[in-house]
């Protein structure tokens, strides 16, 4: 190939360094922060994305704390340990030797402890509830149109198989998207619901991880759907283990 074509880019991950040095001059990309090779035909794992984000730190976000067993990402950003496949390691520790266990989306699911803390397995997050509130519109969106557009979005943009979008609920102005994916359902090559939800979250915030994107342009029958707040709840296959002290705080 010519010198003019000696650049390549990763459509699914801005936070990469790429060069066409793969077989047959195919584009090969590595994630910032970890240096791990990423597959640009699909989504990059949330763990590698967080690691890349921490290599170019920005202001940490603050998230709302819900009740019950559903987890949200209260701890904000951290520099995670990822396994060779790019998944979160079950135990995460910070630089002051404070450790905790996380689920497959990297959200803390135990109290914090010290280096003696054991996390026997990476517990899978099998149900994600994305709770959105849209800005006021002249009228409510048609539910079936909204459902179809969101399912299209998750299939085409986030590469998530339609069977993992369990439901789209709508009571103006609240939209809820339910993603479900058990360990037994996830085949090789399937996008993880946690990764799809993370890409969606970043898109909604105007921090798109895709090349050439600032944020998400979402329309239902030509009418812009503008999200004014987002909450994401994570449900694990095994309930989290927090002390009563935290639960009553």
């Amino acid at each position: 190939h010519t010198a003019a074509q000696d650049n390549c880019t990763c459509p699914t991950n801005k936070m990469t360094v790429c060069s066409p040095d793969g077989p047959g001059g195919r584009c090969q990309c590595r994630a910032l922060g970890s240096g791990m090779a990423v597959d640009c035909s699909t989504l990059t794992s949330k763990c590698l994305l967080l690691k890349a984000r921490m290599s170019a730190p920005k202001n940490a976000r603050t998230l709302v704390r819900p009740s019950e067993h559903a987890l949200v990402d209260n701890d904000g950003l951290y520099d995670p340990d990822c396994d060779p496949e790019g998944r979160f390691k079950a135990r995460q520790c910070n630089q002051t030797s404070v450790c905790w266990c996380v689920n497959s989306v990297g959200v803390r699911r135990t109290d914090k402890g010290d280096l003696s803390l054991r996390c026997d397995e990476l517990v899978r997050t099998h149900h994600i509830l994305i709770d959105l509130r849209h800005r006021p519109t002249a009228g409510a969106f048609n539910h079936s149109d909204l459902d179809a557009e969101l399912r299209r979005l998750f299939r085409e943009r986030y590469r998530l198989h339609p069977k993992f979008v369990a439901a789209v609920h709508y009571e103006q102005p609240t939209i809820q998207i339910e993603l479900r994916q058990n360990t037994s359902q996830k085949a090789a090559g399937d996008v993880d619901i946690g990764d799809a939800a993370y890409y969606f979250e970043r898109d909604i915030k105007g921090e798109s991880l895709f090349q050439g994107r600032g944020g998400l342009d979402l329309r239902v029958r030509g009418e812009p759907l503008q999200v004014e707040r987002t909450l994401i709840y994570y449900l694990d296959e095994i309930p989290p283990k927090f002390s009563m002290k935290r639960l009553t705080a």
Partner: nanobody, 126 residues
Framework: QLQLVESGGGLVQPGGSLKLSCAAS????????IGWFRQAPGKEREGVSC????????YYADSVKGRFTISRDNAKRTVNLQMNSLKPEDTAVYYC???????????????????WGQGTQVTVSS
């Protein structure tokens, strides 16, 4: 930034053929979903065809099905639109676009495509 360049347009008689090519100057099109669109005078831009990045699946508008073929030429780093049995109603400016989508379909909105070319004129006339 991807800068897309279309080539291959021109004047052709009804029933004739043309092959349009889409290339990205300075970049490969690996992993990008590529769509072809056209805009006839006084009409809105419409989707013609696309090829998905995830599995290479293709979509064609009903008006071109069986006559147009979209393909990737990895050696030349292009995405081509082979247009056969051209009709006067195929006259339009043809654009290619690249999107960070995994899949494309009839219902993929044009705003899902991130980068657009300047277009190449196709005129079908006797």
């Amino acid at each position: 930034q991807l800068q897309l360049v279309e080539s291959g347009g021109g004047l052709v008689q009804p029933g004739g053929s043309l092959k349009l090519s889409c290339a990205a100057s300075g970049f490969t099109l690996d992993y990008w979903t590529i769509g072809w669109f056209r805009q006839a005078p006084g009409k809105e831009r419409e989707g013609v065809s696309c090829i998905s990045s995830s599995d290479g699946s293709t979509y064609y508008a009903d008006s071109v099905k069986g006559r147009f073929t979209i393909s990737r030429d990895n050696a030349k780093r292009t995405v081509n639109l082979q247009m056969n049995s051209l009709k006067p109603e195929d006259t339009a400016v043809y654009y290619c676009a690249a999107g960070s989508l995994g899949y494309c379909s009839r219902s993929t909105p044009q705003y899902e495509y991130d980068f657009w070319g300047q277009g190449t004129q196709v005129t079908v006339s006797s």
